[in-house]
């Protein structure tokens, strides 16, 4: 009678993570008597995967009933496959011995490869906001994919970026891999509504890449431009001075009026108007009773935007050299929260 052979018909098996792998194995004879074991890897460092004789194998089931007398099918199924299960599996026949069973014959091995999807890319931007014309870095990370081959692209508002560096780790063989990429983006004043997108393509995604996004609104700071203007006289001896705060982002802004260097009023931007590009405009105004002043008045609009050092714009209010009228420094009309009378 011919000597027993252990046949593993599949040289390789490819399984998606989460699925069940079937590893086929048959013996050509019932003799010699003894159990079958499955191992991952060869040599002394191999891992025992399934033992017909004893043990507990929550994820492993046999394809056929190994207790049946004439059974020669020793195929197994491994459930809920993960990239960590990748490797070469050997079906090994043991001959009954005393005190220990003795390894008799091994199959040629089946290489189990696991295809695992990359995790959703996570894009993160700089910790602090930056202003237009500055270059900022964005990082994109995705983990847990196999095989190693992967493609990563960067886009800003649909336009592909070219200034980026990508690494896939580890460099050598591994059960799964990670990708890390850093892209450099130059900010413009129009970027409040812009998006940076990291796109990852992998064989497991069937042509439907994964995307991670970052909104530049989280990254950009557009400093305001200031303009102080004197409006036509509203009433006798009264001048309306406005401070136009334009094109700023984010909204966090505090404005202080100074009269000849002394603080007159401080207010926080509330009812702002939004521009098409996502920046904001705001206007504050001050009602000045010029008859209360003998000398010229220097009015300063000082703005602190998003915690940055204050910027300011001044306006010199000319006081004409007419004699003060009686009672001109008594209460002037105060028609709104943004008005201020000088006495």
């Amino acid at each position: 009678e011919e000597e027993l052979q252990v046949i593993q018909p599949d040289k390789s098996v490819l399984v998606a993570a989460g699925e069940t792998a079937t590893l086929r194995c048959t013996a050509t004879s019932l003799i010699p008597v003894g159990p079958i074991q499955w191992f991952r890897g060869a040599g002394p460092g191999r891992e025992l995967i399934y033992n017909q004789k004893e043990g507990h194998f929550p994820r492993v089931t046999t394809v056929s009933d190994l207790t049946k007398r004439n059974n020669m099918d020793f195929s197994i199924r491994i459930g809920n496959i993960t990239p960590a299960d990748a490797g070469t599996y050997y079906c090994v026949k043991f001959r009954k011995g005393s005190p220990d069973d003795v390894e008799f014959k091994s199959g040629a091995g089946t290489e189990l490869s696991v295809r695992a999807k990359p995790s959703a890319p996570v894009v993160s931007g700089p910790a602090a906001r930056a202003t237009p014309q500055h270059t900022v870095s964005f990082t994109c990370e995705s983990h847990g994919f196999s095989p190693r081959d992967i493609t990563l692209k960067w886009f800003k508002n649909g336009n592909e970026l070219s200034d980026f560096q990508t690494n896939v780790d580890p460099v050598g063989e591994s059960v799964s891999y990670s990708i890390h990429s850093t892209a450099k983006v130059v900010l413009t004043r129009e970027d409040v509504h812009s998006q940076v997108i990291c796109e990852v393509a992998h064989v497991t995604l069937q042509g439907d890449p994964l995307r991670g996004t970052a909104n530049l609104s989280e990254t950009i700071r557009v400093p305001p431009t200031l303009e102080v203007t004197q409006q036509p006289v509203r009433a006798e001896n009264q001048v309306n001075v406005t401070c136009q705060v334009r094109k700023f982002y984010p909204q966090r802004l505090q404005l202080t009026w100074l009269e000849n260097g002394n603080v007159s009023r401080t207010e926080t931007a509330s009812t702002v108007t939004e521009n098409k590009d996502g920046t904001y405009n705001w206007m504050s105004w001050l009602l000045v009773n010029v008859s209360a002043h003998r000398d010229d008045v220097k009015l300063t609009c000082q703005v602190e935007h998003d915690g940055q050092p204050a910027v300011s714009k001044s306006h010199d209010l000319k006081v004409s050299a007419h004699p003060k009228e009686q009672g001109s420094n008594t209460a002037a009309e105060n028609t709104g929260s943004n008005e201020r009378n000088i006495y």
Epitope: Q37, E47, E54, H56
Partner: nanobody, 124 residues
């Protein structure tokens, strides 16, 4: 050289549960079969439970089957032994073991590396 440190032992009542932990110093922990042995006063050290390096296969001594569960966390270099429905006869020093030696298809009865042990006392 693999260094093993057990923790989680103590004194419990019969019927109680206890979870033992063992942390390994080895960076290649995921390439080591791990297990637990125990030694009661005046007795030989005996195999309790073993787990293969990926955790796919587990082995239990007959008297522990159904009551004890071995598990591992390769990311943290940890192996656990969850012991339920403890009996006074489970009183022993429990040892963590690494690189189990399997002979043929028998349960492991040896190891290359041992921890210092943690005392488990089950009072009736």
């Amino acid at each position: 050289q693999v260094q093993l440190q057990e923790s989680g032992g103590g004194v419990v009542q019969a019927g109680d549960s206890l979870r033992l932990s063992c942390v390994a110093s080895e960076r290649t922990f995921s390439s080591l079969d791990m297990g637990w042995f125990r030694q009661a006063p005046g007795k030989e050290r005996e195999f309790v439970a073993g787990i293969s390096r990926s955790g796919i296969s587990q082995y239990y001594a007959d008297s522990m089957k159904g009551r004890f569960t071995i598990s591992r966390d390769n990311a943290k270099n940890l192996v656990y032994l969850q012991m339920n429905s403890l009996k006074p006869e489970d009183t022993a020093v429990y040892y963590c073991a690494a690189a189990l030696t399997f002979r043929g298809s028998n349960l492991p009865r040896d190891s290359n590396y041992w921890g210092q042990g943690t005392q488990v006392t089950v009072s009736s």
